[in-house]
């Protein structure tokens, strides 16, 4: 019952005389374990005997006996799933059908496997992709339907008989599905490989040749070209002729069109293999190549650089950078089309030839003011000297130079004058656009660079200006030297250091803070009267009569200044004391009499004492002594004493006469 036996193995196995065969095989006997196995060579069923006839290559029975001649053939299987076989060595007459007769307790099966043994090693087979294009990687495959554990082999790739450098990957398969040895080679063919022979060589383990397969490469590629030029160096002068020829060294498939290119651009109406250029001009200098196309694409030749030589063209100057700040670096570049390149340059500044520089580039590390101007140049090569083209302007910029502050007024300047100053400079680039002044003040600038100071102060000492373009340059400060009358005139007491007492030596100083000019005169005045012309006013022995309001005047050529009035105060003890009587020195009894102690004192009398004709002090201490009612016995001589912080003074005697009233006389 066939449904009970399932076999898997290659349908046919290939080998050659002396090699070996390894037959991978699996089976499934559904009704139990294998009890008997016979390997037949070309088995034939005998209907009469109901058995198979044929050469028995291997036999395994229940008792496990195997004939000794069966050692060449090995059953490597087992009783239930593996039926792998090995024949080593294999012989030519092993070709044919192998029959695997399998018997279990209840079932039998004959499985057939084809064996193809050749006399000599058969060749491998090279497989190529359908199309090969240059520079596109392809995989070359060499396949041999053989592999056996007992017989190692190798596959080697050759190109035109020479081993290929690329590393091949060899793989083997010994499975129930397939038995083979395969070598794969990755390879990027070039156009030059077209038509070349590739060989896959089968070798034994010692590298001995067994067989091979060869193929011829068909590498599709764009046309490969060679360009030839007359003259060969491609260097000509204007007016000469040039011939270029394009030769196709290889093309697969055949080429279809031809064209010529200059500097990458196609030349019109040039579709032959020869390009003729007659009476060339410098514009025809450039890189030439020919282009030939086939179905793969266009192929280009190497470029030929055609140099049409000519004398330099009129030159131009490029300046890096203008305008330039004085002290900065500047580079001049002389640009002139010429072939060959100019070997010598002549530089001009403002039309005059400049010596010392013959290079294309002139580098000035730190620019100077006289470098400003127009620069031009002339280039020279072996064919001649060019012309001077238009010049380039170098603008050298710098801050205003030699800035000065100038006083426009006639000198000297007096306090209160209107002063006009101007800010002058020698040169400036760019132009001066504004001015600055120090110190800052509420002054007017009637015009650019002019400063007007109305009512100039005595203390306006120096003024400085700056002229400004992109930078400001300051002038040295100029002294206004303003002249003015003496200032801050005041009277100062030098001695004594304390209060002035009558009889003291006194010195007064006339002080002032400043004067310009310095030469001054002094005047002392009291109550409109001139006292002296020195800076000091001296009193050897001051008297109270010297007290009063003093002023000093200081004058110079500009004017005079008076001090504030200064009060001179003389301190003295009470003096000129006298007793005055009111209503008179003769008073009728019963009336009122007032005695007043009059004095001259500084400070004023602070304490009075009254005395009678007996020099007896009276108990009265005010300036006035009031007697009311006055009595006859009050008659007599009185005097008073005055006291202040300086001292005392006394009056002379003054007599008071009190006479009787008519009533008193009448009573008598």
């Amino acid at each position: 019952d066939s449904s009970k036996w399932v076999f898997e193995h290659p349908e046919t196995l290939y080998a050659w005389e002396g090699a070996c065969v390894w037959i991978p095989c699996t089976y499934r006997a559904l009704d139990g374990d294998l009890e008997s196995f016979i390997l037949f060579h070309n088995p034939e069923y005998n209907k009469n005997t109901s058995k198979f006839d044929g050469t028995r290559l291997y036999e395994s029975t229940k008792d496990g006996k195997v004939p000794s001649e069966q050692k060449r053939v090995q059953f490597l299987g087992d009783k239930n799933k593996n039926c792998t076989l090995s024949i080593h060595p294999v012989h030519l007459n092993d070709s044919g059908q192998l029959g695997l007769r399998m018997e279990s307790k209840t079932e039998k099966w004959m499985e057939r496997i084809h064996l193809n043994v050749s006399e000599r090693p058969f060749p491998p087979h090279i497989q190529l992709p359908p199309e090969i294009q240059e520079s596109q990687e392809v995989t070359l495959t060499c396949l041999l339907n053989f592999s056996c554990y007992g017989y190692p082999i190798q596959l080697q790739w050759l190109l035109e008989g020479v081993p290929m450098r690329q590393a091949a990957v060899t793989s083997t398969s010994l499975t129930i599905k397939s038995v083979f040895t395969r070598s794969e080679l990755k390879f990027s063919p070039q156009w030059s490989h077209h038509g070349k022979i590739v060989t896959c060589q089968l070798q034994d383990a010692d590298g001995k040749f067994l067989s091979n397969d060869t193929v011829q490469l068909n590498v599709k590629h764009t046309p490969k070209l060679e360009i030839k030029v007359t003259p060969s160096d491609a260097i000509v002068r204007e007016g000469d002729s040039v011939t270029m020829t394009c030769e196709v060294s290889s093309s697969n498939p055949e080429y279809t069109t031809v064209s010529w290119l200059k500097d990458g651009t196609s030349l019109k109406k040039q579709n032959t293999f020869t390009l003729n250029l007659r009476e060339v001009t410098k514009d025809q200098s450039g890189k030439y190549c020919c282009q030939v196309s086939n179905d793969v694409g266009p192929g280009r030749s190497e470029e030929v650089f055609l140099q049409v030589q000519y004398a330099p063209e009129p030159s131009t100057v490029q300046i890096l950078h203008s305008p330039a700040v004085e002290g900065s670096q500047v580079e001049f570049l002389c640009m002139s089309l010429a072939n060959p390149l100019p070997t010598n340059y002549t530089w001009y500044h403002n039309g005059k030839e400049m010596q010392g520089r013959t290079e294309e580039k002139v580098h000035i590390p730190k620019i100077l003011p006289w470098h400003a101007g127009t620069y031009s140049c002339v280039a020279e090569n072996i064919l001649g000297t060019g012309q001077r083209g238009p010049g380039a302007e170098l603008d050298v910029q710098y801050p205003p130079k030699k800035v000065t502050t100038v006083i426009q007024n006639p000198m000297p300047i007096r306090e209160g004058d209107t002063v006009t100053l101007s800010c002058n400079y020698n040169s400036s680039n760019p132009s001066v656009t504004r001015y600055e002044w120090k110190p800052h003040g509420a002054w007017e600038e009637p015009s650019l660079g002019v400063l007007k100071i109305q009512n100039v102060g005595w203390d306006n000492t120096t003024i400085a200006c700056a002229a400004c373009n992109s930078w400001c340059s300051w002038a040295s400060p100029v002294a206004l030297n303003v002249q003015y009358a003496p200032r801050d005139v005041r009277v100062r007491k030098i001695k004594p250091l304390s209060e002035i007492h009558s009889g003291n030596s006194v010195s007064l100083q006339c002080d002032f803070s400043s004067s310009h000019p310095k030469e001054v005169q002094f005047f002392w005045e009291k109550n409109g009267r001139l006292l002296g012309k020195e800076s000091q006013l001296n009193f050897d022995s001051i008297s109270p009569e010297d007290a009063g309001s003093y002023s000093c005047w200081v004058n110079n050529s500009i004017g005079q200044t008076a001090s504030k009035a200064w009060t001179l105060e003389v301190l003295y003890a009470p003096r000129r004391l006298r007793v005055s009587m009111s209503p008179g020195d003769q008073v009728m009894e019963g009336k009122s009499a007032t005695l007043t102690c009059e004095s001259d004192a500084n400070p004023p009398v602070s304490h009075y004492t009254w005395f009678d004709w007996n020099n007896q002090s009276l108990p009265y201490h005010s300036q006035k002594l009031r007697l009311e009612p006055v009595k006859v016995q009050h008659s007599g001589a009185y005097w008073c004493q005055g006291t202040n912080s300086v001292g005392k003074g006394r009056s002379p005697l003054s007599t008071l006469t009190v006479y009787y009233s008519p009533e008193t006389i009448g009573r008598r």
């Epitope: 010392g356 520089r357 006289w370 710098y398 130079k401 030699k402 020698n426």
Partner: antibody
Framework: EVQLVESGGGLVKPGGSLRLSCAAS????????MSWIRQAPGKGLEWVSY????????YYADSVKGRFTISRDNAKNSLYLQMNSLRAEDTAVYYC????????????WGQGTLVTVSS | YVLTQPPSVSVAPGKTATITCGGT??????VHWYQQKPGQAPVLAIY???DRPSGIPERFSGSNSGNTATLTISRVEAGDEADYFC???????????FGGGTKLTVL
């Protein structure tokens, strides 16, 4: 060979005048800026005046401004220095010098002529 | 503008001499150096801070930055004994300015 030869020096009284000349040869005189530089006996170098190749640009030291005048005659390959109101402090060896336009340095000097201002 | 040079510098033969030239922000200016031997006119030794005219030995070199320019003479020889002057263009006054000079003595 570049040559600069000064002449015109000598003894002069204070307040007097002298005209120095410099004859140039061995180079294209009209292409070069020129200077006068002086050196008082035993002292250092002092720049006096400078003139551009065409004569359009002229600079003077403050110490001589208003008294000295630089000029040139390109046709005669000559440089001049007119010195007026001479003072004792103007006593020096006066060098005629060729300037390098590009760097401003003095690349050639004459041998100098001595000017003595004394009463 | 004032250029300050040391009055004298002494150096042994074969050694290196350094002569300085000081000035405010001198690094922004072109500095030139002149050599003057007794009784002779000056000779340009260095221009553009560090360039050497033809005929001046490679032993002579210059540098300039900040507030100091320097003339360096390596492997000094007896023939280098001379006065050395630095020079700049003062753009604020439009004047050439020379340093006071340095007397180089070879010991």
């Amino acid at each position: 060979e570049v040559q600069l030869v000064e002449s015109g020096g000598g003894l002069v009284k204070p307040g007097g005048s002298l005209r120095l000349s410099c004859a140039a040869s061995g180079f294209t005189f009209s292409d070069y800026y020129m200077s006068w530089i002086r050196q008082a006996p035993g002292k250092g170098l002092e720049w006096v005046s400078y003139i551009s190749s065409s004569g359009s640009t002229i600079y003077y030291a403050d110490s001589v401004k208003g008294r000295f005048t630089i000029s040139r005659d390109n046709a005669k390959n000559s440089l001049y220095l007119q010195m007026n109101s001479l003072r004792a402090e103007d006593t020096a060896v006066y060098y005629c010098a060729r300037d390098d336009f590009w760097s401003g340095s003095v690349d050639y000097w004459g041998q100098g002529t001595l000017v003595t201002v004394s009463s | 503008y004032v250029l300050t040079q040391p009055p004298s510098v002494s150096v042994a033969p074969g050694k290196t001499a350094t002569i300085t030239c000081g000035g405010t922000n001198i690094g922004s200016k072109n500095v030139h150096w002149y050599q003057q031997k007794p009784g002779q006119a000056p000779v340009l030794a260095i221009y553009y801070d560090s360039d050497r005219p033809s005929g001046i030995p490679e032993r002579f070199s210059g540098s300039n930055s900040g507030n100091t320019a320097t003339l360096t003479i390596s492997r000094v020889e007896a023939g280098d004994e001379a006065d050395y002057f630095c020079q700049v263009w003062d753009s604020s006054s439009d004047h050439w300015v020379f340093g006071g000079g340095t007397k180089l003595t070879v010991l």
